[in-house]
Interface confidence: low
């Protein structure tokens, strides 16, 4: 059994999240994950889900009674979602920490928007796509 | 030329983001995107980037002078990133709108944690991965 399971059970007690009434009014994440089979679609959704959990855990980082559980789960997320790749995890955290109300961040984001958009489509970087685009550029 | 380019230039004026000093102290998104070539890694990062822009645009949704630009760019993001798939966009927006301070949301998130974790690894759902994992479990 993965180490996170026991710790997640501990968090369930702490958050009083074991009762059947918790499932009322549908799920947060599981229903959405069921909708998407394609790996890249799943990553789009899981990226938001993982950042949600990181934010949630951050809110409770000073609570000693669940600190070990939170750390274990975060470490396991690191292994499973980021393949234990520290650079990947760091880049992800950087992105989640940008503040949308910071004026410098706003300016930089708008400054980079055109290039970000150009890279959004899956095939944006392949030679074949580039060539076909050129035909329509005139 | 994609319609978003002209509108992004308009936003650059509004946010005073055309000046060369904006690039001081590195980039927000472009440097990170350069680090990841693998499609699923890119989606993890782009998911955070797109949600950042949606949040930023939401803050300025009442400003008539940039409304058309914002709408055009959002629509183009919808085409490029969500493949014009309304369901995908809706699921994504649902995830970005969950509040980490809402007690019911917290309980549900913890309730679903074990199942979410079980699905995080790319090949978590394939039989082949499951079998190869078993060999190393002892």
């Amino acid at each position: 059994q993965d180490p996170y399971v026991k710790e997640a059970e501990n968090l369930k007690k702490y958050f009083n999240a074991g009762h059947s009434d918790v499932a009322d009014n549908g799920t947060l994440f599981l229903g959405i994950l069921k909708n998407w089979k394609e790996e890249s679609d799943r990553k789009i959704m899981q990226s938001q889900i993982v950042s949600f959990y990181f934010k949630l855990f951050k809110n409770f980082k000073d609570d000693q009674s669940i600190q070990k559980s939170v750390e274990t789960i975060k470490e396991d997320m690191n292994v499973k979602f980021f393949n234990s790749n520290k650079k990947k995890r760091d880049d992800f955290e950087k992105l989640t920490n940008y503040s949308v109300t910071d004026l410098n961040v706003q300016r930089k984001a708008i400054h980079e928007l055109i290039q970000v958009m150009a890279e959004l489509s899956p095939a944006a970087k392949t030679g074949k796509r580039k060539r076909s685009q050129m035909l329509f550029r005139g | 030329q994609d319609p978003y380019v002209k509108e992004a230039e308009n936003l650059k004026k509004y946010f005073n983001a055309g000046h060369s000093d904006v690039a001081d102290n590195g980039t927000l998104f472009l440097g990170i995107l350069k680090n990841w070539k693998e499609e699923s890694d890119r989606k993890i990062m782009q998911s955070q980037i797109v949600s950042f822009y949606f949040k930023l645009f939401k803050n300025f949704k009442d400003d008539q002078s940039i409304q058309k630009s914002v709408e055009t760019i959002k629509e183009d993001m919808n085409v490029k990133f969500f493949n014009s798939n309304k369901k995908k966009r809706d699921d994504f927006e649902k995830l970005t709108n969950y509040s980490v301070t809402d007690l019911n949301v917290q309980r549900k998130a913890i309730h679903e944690l074990i199942q979410v974790m079980a699905e995080l690894s790319p090949a978590a759902k394939t039989g082949k991965r499951k079998r190869s994992q078993m060999l190393f479990r002892g």
């Epitope: - | 650059k12 004026k13 509004y14 946010f15 055309g18 009442d62 400003d63 008539q64 002078s65």
Partner: nanobody, 116 residues
Amino acid sequence: QVQLQESGGGLVQPGGSLRLSCAASGFTSSNYAMSWVRQAPGKGLEWVSSINSRTGSITYADSVKGRFTITLDNAKNTLYLQMNSLKPEDTAVYYCASRVDDRVSRGQGTQVTVSS
């Protein structure tokens, strides 16, 4: 050259109110947005609220929505920020900023301290 001068800051208890003013001069364009931004100790500049002179459109950061109100008196060329239900985390130097076409001008700022 646009000149901006803020006033109205001070020390206030949590839950209290303050009204900031910003006197503006030197505008040669009617296409401008006026904003309030703030800088807490050791933090970067944070956008608080904007009003567009041409359209009257108003926007607020989520952290102040429902508590702060921005208004612009065109006749007096003065921007206001009514701040109610103040919290300790609202402590900062508040600046009035103008986006005139694509140039940003900022005043000297006024200190707001929320503490009991």
